[in-house]
Interface confidence: low
């Protein structure tokens, strides 16, 4: 599996999408786990609803949510209020029994918020935007980052 990079801005939300073959994974619950070290175990963060037919219902664990479009074949993970410690390697998984197939390996990168970067030499003009906190994400603007694309640069 290649690793797909998703970048988000600190303090914003990042949406990670994991496409899969809906027929091949029919009836299977999904999970989002964090890789502990290069060859370590993948620690479960959150999984879809216990009833597969209700997989579309968003489930939260802390600031992480998961929802599964089982017909369209897209698992979506939302990391809310992204923080530097959220950066790291993750996996989208398809569960069957005690086994788990990797749907996608994901590298989450957390960037400073370019739109809310204040610096002695370059002040923002808050009057222009009520909350830069909602602004986009740096390299990759928060919300959802396109695979391989690096959205925002910072501004200090």
């Amino acid at each position: 599996h290649n690793t797909t990079v998703f970048q988000g801005v600190a303090g914003q939300s990042l949406q990670v999408s994991c496409p899969y073959d809906s027929m091949k994974h029919w009836g299977r619950r999904k999970a989002w786990c964090r890789q502990l070290g290069e060859k370590g175990p993948c620690q479960r963060v959150v999984s879809t609803h216990n009833l597969w037919l209700l997989s579309f219902l968003r489930r939260w664990n802390g600031s992480t949510a998961i929802t599964d479009d089982t017909l369209g074949g897209t698992l979506t993970i939302t990391l809310r209020n992204l923080q530097p410690h959220d950066a790291g390697l993750y996996q989208c998984q398809s569960l069957h029994g005690s086994e788990a197939d990797t749907l996608r390996k994901v590298l989450v990168e957390v960037l400073a918020d370019p739109l809310d970067h204040r610096d002695a030499g370059d002040l923002w003009f808050p009057g222009e935007s009520e909350s830069f906190e909602d602004a986009h994400v740096e390299h990759s603007i928060s919300r959802s980052l396109l695979e391989g694309e690096i959205p925002f640069p910072p501004t200090s």
Epitope: D134, A135, H139, I150, P151, P153, S156
Partner: antibody
Amino acid sequence: DVQLQESGPGLVKPSQSLSLTCTVTGYSITSDYAWNWIRQFPGNRLEWMGYISFSGSTSYNPSLKSRISITRDTSKNQFFLQLNSVTTEDTATYYCARWNGNYGFAYWGQGTLVTVSA
Amino acid sequence: DVVMTQTPLSLPVSLGDQASISCRSSQSLVHINGNTYLHWYLQKPGQSPKLLIYKVSNRFSGVPDRFSGSGSGTDFTLKISRVEAEDLGVYFCSQSTHVTFTFGSGTKLEIK
């Protein structure tokens, strides 16, 4: 692929307002990134004017702050530039561009020439 | 604002030659996160600027490897190892480390 297209009047009278539209296809302006206006004066000098981010936040070049407004119509996937009280100094080719963070301005429109003249 | 100073303003070259363009910023372009947001664009006659190099030294997709970028802090260089006819145009450096994004004045690469 993402495409940006500027449109608007090519001639504006001094003291009036300049209004341009950037129509984006192939990507939703509410998904990510910052959507910018940049202008190029005769002689090639480029000036960043401002942007509206996917969330609707705006940031403007301080040199234009009192005259500029960037807004959007998410239903049409368009964003707009309004520059008030124009003078002949505002004659330029106006570009809209998507700011991709690490990549800077990776996608540009083809530009539209606006002449300010009586 | 951060002032970007490009030299030379005009660069006459022969096809196949190496070309070098310098860009200097009035303040450091190293962002608080450690990245340096200095980019290079090429504008061919009648076209909009196109991204060549991002973050100092990374070639954008589809950009030939004869283009290379280097530098740090406030001093940056774009090099073209073997100039081809399609490389002619105006080159701009630009910074997006600081909120008011700024561009260099441009360097026109032309045939000697």
